[in-house]
């Protein structure tokens, strides 16, 4: 990678003191002659983050390899993207610095994000000054995403970018709607062209394993080392206050690299210098931490001390990142004190050792509790250690106990005991329990008592129709949750079995005992609709309905009619037990009541969708019956009726209704209205001679009242057949009476 560093001075109390410096460690950089290639360029990039125009910035060249930008007059001048371009020809490289305003509404938790191709990047903008408006995320200045202000999590707005690819790289920003763009949180996303640990055109080459936070360049496989580290794998720390690929540059000023942000060629990005952290790189590392942004932990051994710039400083006779390596005696490295494997597995166990002389494959062995010695089948030799790999024969319970890894060289020997626990995969002792069932699903409680060892990592539920030879269906579920088996056949028995697994390879146990679970009958799917209804009395309602026409047999046992009396909060249910029925008479209803009516098909205990509701108003109950009805024949075609008004009337009578019927006749009765409710007699005319008639009457207020007693009377003489009975007005009656 090109040796190019962009330094930003972050002492922001006075923008006029702010400066940016671009430093190149390349031979002859910045001289500008054809022989030495193009000069260093340092500029503000206004393509994405536009700031109000101000006085031009001053560019000063300091020798052949350094250029500085000054002349910032106000804080808003600082906000945005700055870039330094250096290197010649194919090596020409741009280094980018993104500056955020410390007073912005939103601040980035971390400005530079370097991720591998295919990773998920998460940009986090912390709320500094809240606004109750949308937050707009932009990518390279263009709209990208919106969040509602309610979507903040722990005072942060997160943008998740799954499966990122190199074109996703760029400047991202989070801004409150209506806020100045200068109040945005600005981020830089760098997506390496390869997955983790790989580089090259087809990402086929393996990275060298960059140390101390170095990042593997996806084009050339070199480590881009954090400021303050050098070496092909960044294994070596510079002296305090120095940076550059060969530690050749020195931080300006008496406080060293405090308050400086360092930006390096991609895919590194920007960070504080070694030994410093914080948004303005002014905080020293906490004890036990070191390196750029204090991201590394010392964990020094053998009396080593932690230096926040270089890491562990080892006492005489010890070396290694954590002072863990003796200069002579071999040593087993990083051996876990306890390992766990599942019964009947054939695990690989690694044992790493270092020393002087260097351990080789044959000098490392593994001893089982029964004394059997295993020799390694493979060894990986690295600059600081040898790792021997042992293929263990199929484990039995007797293999539980203390194993030992031993290394022997002419420099001495070392051994490390570690405990191996052989665990028995869990086997259910009981069948799963059915919780609820529907026509197409069963809800099952899968976790049962088991033999063998926990913890249970996964539960597999195997199921298939009873007596079936088809393959088992399998569902993997969370151990703590009930499981719903979906898309089953109605009215079908299923054989259901549980298989439990514990963590690790070979952790699957044998299947538990089966149980039979039967799905419910299918729920009716047809939605009826109400065709009509009519009132057959103050307390009687006849209802009719229809069903959609569908091919095949009707799934249903009958219908449920529901009448809801909202005023009284009462529901009346009427069961019609024939699926062929399309009408029903509802009796015993409350007169004068507003009912909501619907109908639904049922099958077994399951109800189908209800019809859209209808609203029905039953007429109120009418007045009591008229009293003392009496009939008197006047001629061969006339009969006079007399009566007394009903007692305890709830209101004024609107009319009387007389029912006339030939005694013993089969025809329908005739109803005649008496529209003068104050009267107590009327003459029925047009009757047939010598014919016996039955009479009864009732009063009407808002609704028709109760019938009176029935009276009989015959017309006189042998007259001609009349056209039919009619009611004579009171005036005529008075004339006859007189």
């Amino acid at each position: 990678a090109v040796d190019l560093t962009l330094l930003a001075n972050l002492r922001l109390t006075d923008p006029q003191r702010f400066f940016l410096t671009c430093v190149s460690g390349e031979a002859g950089a910045g001289r500008g002659s054809d022989a030495w290639g193009p000069p260093l360029l340092l500029e503000k990039d206004d393509r994405i983050v536009r700031t109000p125009p101000g006085p031009p910035l001053r560019l000063a060249r300091n020798g052949s390899h350094q250029v500085t930008l000054r002349g910032f007059s106000k804080p808003s001048d600082l906000v945005g993207v700055f870039s330094c371009v250096g290197g010649a020809g194919a090596r020409r490289t741009r280094v980018i610095y993104v500056h955020n305003s410390p007073g912005a509404h939103l601040l980035p938790d971390k400005v530079t994000h370097t991720v591998n191709k295919g990773d998920t990047a998460v940009l986090s903008a912390r709320v500094h000054k809240e606004k109750q408006t949308d937050v707009i995320w932009k990518s390279n200045g263009s709209y990208f995403y919106t969040l509602d202000w309610h979507e903040a999590q722990d005072g942060r707005f997160l943008l998740q970018l799954p499966n990122v690819q190199p074109p996703s790289s760029g400047i991202y920003s989070a801004t409150y709607l209506e806020a100045s763009p200068l109040g945005s949180a600005f981020f830089r996303l760098i997506v390496r062209g390869c997955g983790a640990g790989r580089w090259g055109p087809g990402c086929t080459k393996e990275c060298p394993g960059c140390l101390h936070g170095g990042v593997c360049h996806d084009h050339d496989g070199e480590c881009v080392c954090p400021p303050g580290f050098t070496g092909t794998r960044c294994e070596q720390a510079c002296r305090e206050g120095r940076f550059g690929q060969s530690c050749q540059e020195q931080c300006p000023g008496i406080s060293g690299c405090r308050g400086l942000t360092f930006c390096l060629p991609d895919p590194y990005g920007c960070s504080c210098g070694s030994g410093w952290r914080g948004s303005q790189c002014q905080e020293a590392c906490a004890p036990g931490h070191f390196g750029a942004d204090c991201r590394l932990q010392c964990q020094c051994q053998n009396g080593g001390t932690c230096d926040r710039f270089s890491g562990c400083v080892c006492p005489s006779g010890w070396h290694g990142v954590h002072c863990e390596k003796s200069d002579r005696i071999p040593q087993i490295l990083n051996m876990a004190s306890e390992l766990e494997f599942n019964l009947e597995t054939m695990p690989r166990i690694n044992c790493a050792a270092a020393g002087n002389p260097f351990p080789v494959r044959g000098s490392i062995e593994l001893r089982k509790p029964d004394g059997t010695v295993l020799l390694s089948t493979k060894a990986i030799v690295e600059p600081e250690k040898t790792t021997a790999e042992f293929e263990v024969p199929r484990l039995v319970l007797a293999d539980s106990g203390f194993w030992e890894c031993r290394v022997s060289t002419s420099g001495g020997q070392d051994s490390r005991r570690f405990k191996v626990n052989v665990k028995v995969p869990p086997v259910p002792l009981a069948a799963p329990r059915l919780l609820t069932k529907q026509s197409r699903q069963l809800v099952v409680s899968p976790l049962v008592s088991f033999s063998g060892d926990g913890p249970i990592s996964t539960v597999r539920l195997h199921y298939r129709p009873q007596d079936s030879t088809m393959d088992w269906s399998t569902i993997v579920v969370d151990p703590s949750e009930n499981v719903t088996l979906m898309n089953l056949r109605p009215k079908t028995g299923y054989s259901v079995r549980v298989q439990l697994s514990r963590p690790g390879e070979g952790g699957e146990g044998a299947w538990g005992p089966p149980t039979l679970m039967t799905t419910d009958c299918p729920e009716p799917l047809l939605q009826p609709w109400l065709e009509g209804w009519h009132v057959e009395g103050t307390d009687r309602l006849r209802v009719s309905w229809s069903l959609p026409l569908v091919p095949g047999p009707l799934v249903g046992d009958g219908f449920l009619l529901r009448l809801w009396d909202g005023t009284r909060g009462q529901e009346r249910r009427e069961n019609v037990s024939s699926p062929q029925a399309r009408t029903a008479l509802l009796t015993g209803l409350t007169p004068g009541t507003h009912y909501q009516l619907d109908v639904q098909l049922y099958h077994c205990t399951l109800l189908g969708p209800a019809s859209p509701p209808a609203h029905v108003l039953l007429p109120p109950s009418g007045p009591p019956a008229p009293r003392h009805l009496h009939a008197q024949a006047l001629s061969d075609s006339e009969i006079q009726l007399t009566w007394k008004h009903p007692e305890a009337l709830p209101g004024p009578i609107s009319k009387y209704v007389v029912e006339v019927q030939v005694a013993g006749g089969a025809g329908d009765p005739l109803w005649i209205d008496v529209d003068r409710p104050e009267e107590t007699s009327t003459i029925i005319r047009g009757l047939n001679a010598s014919t016996r008639y039955l009479f009864r009457m009732r009063a009407s207020i808002q609704g028709l009242g109760d019938w009176s007693n029935t009276v009989e009377e015959s017309t006189l003489g042998n007259g001609l057949q009349a056209e039919g009975p009619v009611q004579e007005s009171r005036a005529a009656e008075e004339g006859l009476d007189q």
């Epitope: 949308d134 707009i136 932009k138 200045g141 263009s142 709209y143 990208f144 995403y145 919106t146 969040l147 509602d148 309610h150 979507e151 801004t175 709607l177 209506e178």
Partner: antibody
Framework: EVQLLESGGGLVQPGGSLRLSCAAS????????MNWVRQAPGKGLEWVSV????????YYADSVKGRFTISRDNSKNTLYLQMNSLRAEDTAVYYC???????????????WGQGTLVTVSS | DIQMTQSPSSLSASVGDRVTITCQAS??????LNWYQQKPGKAPKLLIY???NLETGVPSRFSGSGSGTDFTLTISSLQPEDFATYYC?????????FGQGTKVEVK
């Protein structure tokens, strides 16, 4: 080319339910706010609901609150409107419209579907 | 909720006329207002966004102005294809609200 295609409209009785869908193509659906806007026959436009890209935040017009539910399936590039307890006054052409803020922070319903007619009648 | 009052509800004009439609918000909505045109049987079309910005592809005879509570859509010289219904929309807060619409008819 951006396309929004509504479906699922039709005749439904008062109190009934209907689910409208809007299939989107030609843009990164999962990054945009989506709206439903309706227009009763012979009447003006009425904004109904919005859902944010994550699907985690929604808003509704008072006239439909508690009855309508907006949702989205970003994996299928589809917007939905579940309408329950329908009333005669919900009869309208329902449009889906993508809403976004451009890089200057200006909001626009720039893309609209052709609409689907919902008729609520007994 | 912010109410939007659009006037007039309809107007008759001739080709070449200057037409002005106003929209009044019940409270300050800054510049968060768009104007739309709708023709019968068609979806609305964005004309002006953020009170005064002309949408790409919209003829320059359309212009928008105003801020706060009072906004205006102006068609400097009415063309035959401009006979339609016009709506304003506030997007300052939820619920979003359209104006009642202004129908521009042939005189």
């Amino acid at each position: 080319e951006v396309q929004l295609l509504e479906s699922g409209g039709g005749l439904v009785q008062p109190g009934g339910s209907l689910r409208l869908s809007c299939a989107a193509s030609g843009f990164t659906f999962s990054n945009y706010k989506m709206n439903w806007v309706r227009q009763a026959p012979g009447k003006g436009l009425e904004w109904v609901s919005v859902i944010y890209p994550s699907g985690g935040w929604t808003y509704y017009a008072d006239s439909v609150k508690g009855r309508f539910t907006i949702s989205r399936d970003n994996s299928k590039n589809t917007l939905y409107l579940q309408m329950n307890s329908l009333r005669a006054e919900d009869t309208a052409v329902y449009y889906c419209a993508s809403g976004y803020y451009d890089s200057s922070g200006y909001s626009r319903f720039d893309y609209w579907g052709q609409g689907t007619l919902v008729t609520v009648s007994s | 909720d912010i109410q939007m009052t659009q006037s007039p509800s309809s107007l008759s004009a001739s080709v070449g006329d200057r037409v002005t439609i106003t929209c009044q918000a019940s409270q300050d909505i800054s510049n968060y207002l768009n104007w739309y045109q709708q023709k019968p049987g068609k979806a609305p079309k964005l004309l002006i966004y953020h009170a005064s910005n002309l949408e790409t592809g919209v003829p320059s005879r359309f212009s928008g102005s105003g801020s706060g509570t009072d906004f205006t859509l102006t068609i400097s010289s009415l063309q035959p294809e401009d006979f339609a219904t016009y709506y304003c929309l506030q997007y300052k807060s939820y619920p979003r609200l359209f104006g009642q619409g202004t129908k521009v008819e042939v005189k």
